[in-house]
């Protein structure tokens, strides 16, 4: 759930990393209400995810490593 580029809540679904091409960090102290990871999918969707959840941290790590290796 997002509005004016701010996530207002988090997805209930677990996204597979193979569908994700990148992510953006949303910080609560930078104009939005909550901290979030915004995953960008191959289908050009933006999905708001809870940055505290293990699967989210895991994908962030995988994507960060991919960028480093490019």
């Amino acid at each position: 759930a997002s509005n004016f580029d701010c996530c207002l809540g988090y997805t209930d679904r677990i996204l597979h990393p193979k569908f994700i091409v990148g992510f953006t960090r949303q910080l609560a102290n930078e104009g939005c209400d909550i901290n979030a990871i915004i995953f960008h999918t191959k289908k050009k969707l933006s999905v708001c995810a809870n940055p505290k959840q293990t699967w989210v941290k895991y994908i962030v790590r995988l994507l960060s490593k991919k960028v480093k290796n490019m």
């Epitope: 677990i14 990393p17 293990t54 699967w55 995988l62």
Partner: antibody, heavy 120, light 107 residues
Framework: QVQLVQSGAEVKKPGSSVKVSCKAS????????ISWVRQAPGQGLEWMGG????????NYAQKFQGRVTITADESTSTAYMELSSLRSEDTAVYYC?????????????WGRGTLVTVSS | AIQLTQSPSSLTASVGDRVTITCRAS??????VGWYQQKPGKAPKLLIY???SLQSGVPPRFSGSGSGTEFTFTISSLQPEDFATYYC?????????FGQGTKVEIK
Amino acid sequence: QVQLVQSGAEVKKPGSSVKVSCKASGGTFSSYAISWVRQAPGQGLEWMGGIIPIFGTANYAQKFQGRVTITADESTSTAYMELSSLRSEDTAVYYCAGGSITGTTPFDYWGRGTLVTVSS
Amino acid sequence: AIQLTQSPSSLTASVGDRVTITCRASQFASNDVGWYQQKPGKAPKLLIYAASSLQSGVPPRFSGSGSGTEFTFTISSLQPEDFATYYCLQDYTYPLTFGQGTKVEIK
């Protein structure tokens, strides 16, 4: 209550490989992340890497990259950690630990540990 | 990688004492720090998660606080079964890292 049952102690020669297993029961294996943590005698805890079985992709600590392989078999609810090119410093207790992928704590459940001794 | 510096590395205390252990992170770790207890020959046990939340079934004499880079773990009144080694863990970002441990011994 999730239980993680590890394979038995191993004695290995320097330069060889070891493969330790961790079988999960009492929960949905696909909804867990499994990590491997080692502890050398008298030393602290060290995260080696982990895997989310439904993702299939493992995630390793830089120190072990290229020497460790973590895999998971969803059909048997078992995770594996293989460490190659063993040296004496790899003598340690190897723990598997798990947590829900939708949870916020990585290590809710632990195996009892597997002692791997590397000696010529 | 975020490095965690735990202090002290060991301490001696008596039953009933208040014990405090600190954990300093080399980088921002939000409140994503947990505390584990380990007894000799046993696997670690989670006591505190998210810096200050008490794990289910853990006695309330254990508590945690802090955020950012400074974290504190407290045992309000040390019991005989609390003599063990305690580790902090950050799971803010991979790779996950532990502090070096604090051994709590009987005075």
